[in-house]
């Protein structure tokens, strides 16, 4: 079929459309959505094509993190003539098709959402046959995952010269506010690191010092919720050990 | 470490039949395209056939349809390359390829040689 | 199928200076969604092909950045800015867009 110079045109709704007096390949797809951890959520993706009545076998795919050279995380064949989309892959069981490819729409459920689902996924039509053809949408939709605070690490560490430090490590999306309570702290931010790279939604703060014997709370809250821990240090008196 | 290993080629008579492997290792095989390019003496490069993720769309060039099928086993990362009816013009090294639509054949195999001759 | 023509046949260059081969489609590779499917690939003696340019202007991982890329719709061109002594070998164009998927005839790179 013709190809012709491209004319791109975007708006707010991440309609992705490449024209031409010819043909119009376009897909359809929302700037963000937004769900909670172990909720499931929706990511709609509709397209249009300029092969009509287009029967033949297609192929579906969702990718993450990138287009075209992404991870799939899901995929599914339709024979030619059939309405049904067969599964072949989906990460970890928890990708399913909400819409019907033969109707322009690749819609995308995610079950059980974790922290870890937060990124940008890619629709991906391709049509094999006697039509061949493909179509990726470059932009997007970004799933942003939230999460109530959870404390995932709390540990009393030993220092230089017989010295501890405390270090708590929380997730949570938006990424919580730590606080330390404990004998002679009151409530102290102490020393919160930023996240990390690579580890968005985790924070960790650190007590330097733990100069009394006894609990030391962790605190994490977010807009969502909060959670806690707790610590205990009791040093041997006279000697170099600790026991936590 | 990606990587494609062609199995074999070998001597084969005219009319006669051969199949080539190929073990892919340090990517997800089922996320790709997977093609067969050949190389005939001395000459350039020669797209052969291809085939879907799933092995259910397959692509042949015309001068080895109905002669050549291309298959896979996604559970044992392997490509392959049944070839009947072999004639001479088949002789070439036949490199075992990712196919990746919007990324080319971005990595090859060594290459194995299949010479045709009585 | 779509015909890749190169062009020249075969090129000297001197180690340092830069050199480009040309590669022209019989049909336009730029599909509707603005990807032009056309890659480049080296093969250097007695070894496989190698890409080196994907999507017309797409440095390849592990590729040095004295290759680049460019073109319109039917005409591309591949640019070596320093030619140096591994660069010598057979530089093929391709395309991905329609089946039967071709390659041009190569261009051979010599050092002068």
């Known amino acids: 079929f013709v190809r012709t110079k491209i004319d791109t045109t975007e708006n707010l709704l991440n309609t992705e459309v490449h024209s031409s007096p010819a043909q119009r390949w376009s897909m359809q797809v929302p700037p963000e959505v937004s769900a909670e951890a172990g909720d499931a959520a929706v990511l709609p993706c509709t397209f249009t094509h300029p092969h009509r009545h287009y029967d033949g076998p297609l192929t579906a795919i969702w990718r993450a993190g990138e287009p075209y050279a992404g991870p799939q995380v899901f995929r599914c064949a339709a024979a030619r003539g059939s309405e049904l989309c067969q599964t072949a892959l989906s990460l970890h069981g928890r990708f399913r098709l909400l819409g019907n490819p033969r109707r322009n729409d690749l819609s995308l459920r995610v079950e059980r959402l974790a922290l870890a689902d937060d990124r940008r996924y890619f629709c991906r039509v391709e049509f094999a046959g006697d039509v061949h053809d493909r179509y990726e949408s470059r932009h997007g939709v970004r799933l942003h995952v939230t999460a109530a605070p959870r404390i995932v690490n709390i540990s009393v560490l030993p220092s230089p010269a017989h010295a501890f430090r405390a270090l708590c490590t929380a997730e949570g999306e938006p990424p919580p506010a730590l606080a330390w309570s404990g004998p002679a702290l009151g409530n102290s931010l102490a020393a919160v690191r930023s996240p990390r790279e690579g580890h968005g939604h985790l924070v960790t703060a650190e007590l330097p010092a733990l100069t009394h014997d006894g609990r030391y709370t962790c605190t994490a809250a977010n807009s969502l919720g909060r959670s806690e821990a707790s610590v205990y240090l009791f040093r041997f008196h006279g000697a170099s050990g600790a026991s936590t | 470490e990606v990587q494609v290993v062609e199995s074999d080629g070998g001597f084969v008579q005219p009319g006669r039949s051969l199949k080539l492997s190929c073990a892919a290792s340090?990517?997800?095989?089922?996320?790709?395209?997977m093609a067969w390019v050949r190389q005939a003496p001395t000459k350039g490069l020669e797209w052969v056939a291809a085939i879907s993720y799933d092995g259910i769309t397959t692509y042949y060039r015309d001068s080895v349809m109905g002669r050549f099928t291309i298959s896979r086993d996604n559970a044992q990362n392997t490509l392959y390359l049944q070839m009947d009816s072999l004639r001479s013009e088949d002789t070439a090294t036949y490199y075992c390829t990712r196919h990746d639509w919007e990324g080319g054949f971005a990595y090859w195999g060594q290459g194995t040689l299949v010479t045709v001759s009585s | 199928g779509i015909v890749m023509t190169q062009a020249p046949l075969s090129v000297s260059v001197t180690p340092g200076e830069s050199a480009s081969i040309s590669c022209r489609s019989s049909k336009s590779l730029l599909h509707s969604s603005g990807i032009t499917y056309v890659f480049w690939y080296l093969q250097k003696p007695g070894k496989s092909p190698q890409l080196l340019i994907y999507?017309?202007?797409n440095l390849a991982s592990g590729v040095p950045d004295r290759f680049s890329g460019s073109g319109s719709e039917t005409d591309f061109t591949l640019k070596i800015s320093r030619m140096e002594a591994e660069d010598v070998g057979i530089y093929y164009c391709?395309?991905?867009?329609?089946?039967?998927?071709?390659f041009g005839s190569g261009t051979k790179l010599e050092i002068k």
């Open positions: 999507r017309m202007s």
């Open positions: 391709g395309q991905l867009l329609e089946n039967p998927f071709t």
């Open positions: 340090g990517f997800t095989f089922s996320d790709y395209y």
